[in-house]
């Protein structure tokens, strides 16, 4: 008894296609071993016709394929353009030889059944319209015209020229003549349904002098396109239903037994299971649209259908397109946190994976908005200006080649709660969805900057201090200057006398930044942050305003400023918190390059930007947020 299973008998007709599915036991060896389809000869030898190793016999060239679906433990042999010569005994099997595990399949291909000689075959998809052409002689020009459908020996009238219409064809069938034509009439049947298929007879006149035409109507159910996607990746359903439904509401639904449950439609309906990870995008004025779903889950696998109807719901007799989605659990896309938590005033660091083979691709971060079709405006990108309202509090850190980039958002408010997408202009499968949940803070932030109203005077020395709790003691502290192309970590003190410098007084848990001397271009947002290795953690931001020295203003020397910072109560600076670092994403230490690389990535993006002031601090607004 073979552990391989499939259809024992397959029957079809010439010209048709068959898809033979063979099932194998779910083991790692079976998933990866050679799959084959061979034809059993009289001598007992089974000649390979196609195999998963890429072999394709001459007689199958251009008309057959073998696809393995390891997540289903199946493989499918598709054979098109069948002829009667394909009738025979076959084996579908696994193994390096054709004597391994197999299943016997009998394929029978018959001749196309004979219709009356003058039968015209019409092949249409569900929901479409067929126009049946009926010819007649001049003698029947004024006679009754009709179309009937054969049911066994009987022929039931569908429509006739006396304006009779069968109730099941009401509002769907019309009988008409074109122009001055005296020898032909037409019957249109719209919104075709499967039960419309069959043999029709159109007739002009009565009795032996009547003119008759036979029409065979085939109504095709949509053949589902197979989509094979990885867990956590994304899928796009491209839907093209034709001009005739361009103005009707569109939908995507998921088949469930007899029904098809709407996931999204253009009337604003959306399934909560897809909240934050679905977009419906009209493509043109001809009714084309696409639906993108990100963050694919195992339970997303199944049969999907897109369609159009004024109700935004599936309706029999309206055009549809179908897919079957398989979700492969052996995904190349790493598992990242789907929910990130933060508190008001705090910050989050979100790691976005991307295809490591596409390190030069442009990276983006967008905010999913739940308008009627869903949309995701870009907030930040490697070559995109930070959106208004996010200046000074949002930065994207790219590390080419690492397979991930990090987005940091600080000065959080409850309005920041929602869904965000990580995406690139490269491999579209690598789109990930993150839900950000921002709760009201119940205690002071972990990082605090003094002075809080930071105004530096040109030509003087200016120091700001960042207080951190003991739990960050072992982590690296840094200051960086925010600009539209990221937050560039400031060089250490010995990298130039004029440069900003960073020093840390471990005894009082303060990291200070000194600008000496202050210049006009030093104005802007500065971030104080911590990182572990190259994994970014908590950040806080402060806007430093720069002004001219006014006559008579007191001159504070740098040591006084530092001393003032050190006057902060030590207990407060040392306060150790037991709160979980819940607002940090699961960050991978490999994801970040050194500071120089981050700087270079920013400079590179700067070169490509049209706007001249995008990266300069002087170009930033002076208002504090």
């Amino acid at each position: 008894q073979s552990p391989i299973f499939g259809p024992q008998d397959v029957s079809s007709i010439e010209g048709n296609s068959v898809s033979i599915t063979c099932y194998y036991p779910d083991t790692s060896v079976n998933r990866h071993t050679r799959k084959y389809w061979c034809r059993q000869g009289a001598n007992g030898y089974c000649a390979t016709l196609i195999s998963s190793n890429g072999y394709l016999s001459k007689e199958y060239s251009g008309r057959a394929s073998l696809i393995n679906f390891p997540e289903n433990s199946t493989f499918v042999i598709n054979i098109a353009h069948l002829t009667q010569e394909d009738t025979g005994s076959y084996k579908c099997g696994l193994g390096t030889t054709n004597r391994g595990l197999f299943f016997d399949v009998s394929l029978e291909v018959s001749q196309v059944p004979e219709f009356p000689n003058d039968t015209h075959v019409y092949t249409k998809d569900i929901g479409r319209t067929v126009t049946i052409e009926c010819r007649f002689k001049e003698g029947n020009a004024h006679s009754k015209k009709s179309l009937c459908k054969k049911r066994g020996e009987a022929c039931e009238v569908v429509i006739d020229s006396t304006e009779y219409v069968d109730p099941s064809y009401k509002d769907r069938a019309i009988l008409f003549m074109k122009g001055t034509s005296r020898d032909i009439f037409y019957v249109n049947i719209s919104h075709l349904i499967p039960s419309d298929a069959g043999l029709y007879v159109c007739q002009a006149g009565e009795g032996p002098s009547a003119d008759k035409n036979n029409a065979d109507l085939q109504v095709l159910e949509p053949e589902p396109e197979l989509l094979y996607k990885d867990l956590r990746s994304s899928v796009t359903f491209e839907c093209d239903l034709g001009r005739e439904v361009a103005n009707d509401a569109k939908y995507l639904c998921r088949k469930n037994k007899e029904t098809c449950d709407v996931i999204i439609n253009t009337l604003g309906k959306r399934d909560p299971a897809f909240e934050g990870r679905i977009l419906l995008t009209p493509r043109d004025d001809n009714g084309r649209f696409s639906v993108l779903i990100t963050g694919l889950r195992k339970e997303d696998a199944g049969h999907y259908q897109c369609g159009a109807h004024s109700s935004g719901l599936p309706q029999e007799g309206w055009p549809v397109q179908a897919w079957q989605l398989f979700v492969n659990e052996e995904s190349t896309i790493p598992n990242s946190r789907s929910v990130v938590k933060g508190v008001t005033g705090g910050s989050v660091a979100i790691v976005c994976p991307y295809n490591p083979k596409e390190s030069s691709s442009l990276k983006y971060w967008c905010h999913w908005e739940a308008d009627e079709n869903g949309r995701c405006p870009v907030l930040v990108g490697t070559q995109a200006l930070v959106q208004e309202g996010y200046e000074g509090r949002l930065a994207l850190f790219d590390q080419p080649g690492s397979g991930a980039y990090t987005v940091i958002l600080n000065q959080l408010t409850t309005q920041d709660s929602g869904f965000y997408w990580c995406l690139t202009d490269g491999d579209s499968r690598w789109r990930t969805t993150i839900e950000l949940q921002v709760a009201e803070a119940t205690k002071k932030p972990d990082l605090e900057v003094t002075p809080q109203n930071a105004t530096a005077v040109i030509g003087e020395t200016f120091t700001i201090s960042c207080h951190y709790p003991c739990k960050f003691y072992s982590q690296e502290k840094y200051w960086c200057k925010w600009s539209n192309d990221g937050c560039h970590i400031l060089p250490s003190h010995d990298e130039g006398a004029r440069q900003s410098s960073v020093s840390c007084d471990q005894s009082s848990q303060i990291v200070s930044m000194t600008l000496n001397p202050v210049k006009k271009e030093d104005e802007g947002w500065y971030w104080c942050g911590v990182k572990e290795g190259q994994v970014y953690g908590e950040t806080t931001a402060i806007y430093v305003a720069v002004e001219e020295r006014t006559r008579g203003s007191p001159h504070i020397n740098p040591t006084d400023a530092n001393a003032r910072a050190k006057d902060a109560p030590e207990e407060e600076a040392m306060e150790s918190s037991v709160r979980e670092d819940e607002n940090k994403a699961n960050l991978d230490p490999r994801l970040f390059a050194d500071e120089r690389e981050i700087q270079n990535a920013g400079d590179q993006a700067q070169e490509n930007r049209a706007s001249g002031n995008a990266g300069s601090a002087g170009g930033q607004s002076g208002s504090s947020k």
Partner: nanobody
Framework: EVQLVESGGGLVQAGGSLRLSCAAS??????????MGWFRQAPGKEREFVSA???????????YYADSMKGRLTISRDNAKNTVYLQMNSLKPEDTAVYYC???????????????????WGQGTQVTVSS
């Protein structure tokens, strides 16, 4: 909702034959868009796959049979009557069971032996094979 009604069961001697019928009704879809089949359950045992028939279109179909009954079964259907038949030959006492007609609109991509994939089940018809 699809209703399935089985008939044709009964008492038969070992070596004899039976033809089971299953009439389907209540669907807005064409009968050929369903996979139809049979499962059976012997006293104290799990329900097991017997046979299935899937139509891809009016002229292409796939017949599946359980290994244990291969060569003794023929599944067929009459689309005009919305009925599926199971011809069972050379019956053995171990074929004694309640035979259930099943249907699913899910198409070709599922293992027909997996009973979880069938959305509709009949009430069953008893087949008893005496020795």
């Amino acid at each position: 909702e699809v209703q399935l009604v089985e008939s044709g069961g009964g008492l038969v001697q070992a070596g004899g034959s039976l033809r089971l019928s299953c009439a389907a009704s209540g669907s807005g879809r064409t009968f050929t868009s369903y996979t139809m089949g049979w499962f059976r359950q012997a006293p104290g045992k799990e329900r097991e796959f017997v046979s299935a028939l899937t139509w891809a279109d009016d002229s292409t179909y796939y017949k599946y049979y359980a290994d244990s009954m291969k060569g003794r079964l023929t599944i067929s259907r009459d689309n005009a009557k919305n009925t599926v038949y199971l011809q069972m030959n050379s019956l053995k006492p171990e074929d004694t069971a309640v035979y259930y007609c099943v249907a699913t609109g899910r198409g070709l991509t599922y293992d027909p032996r997996d009973r979880r994939k069938y959305d509709y089940w009949g009430q069953g018809t008893q087949v008893t094979v005496s020795s």
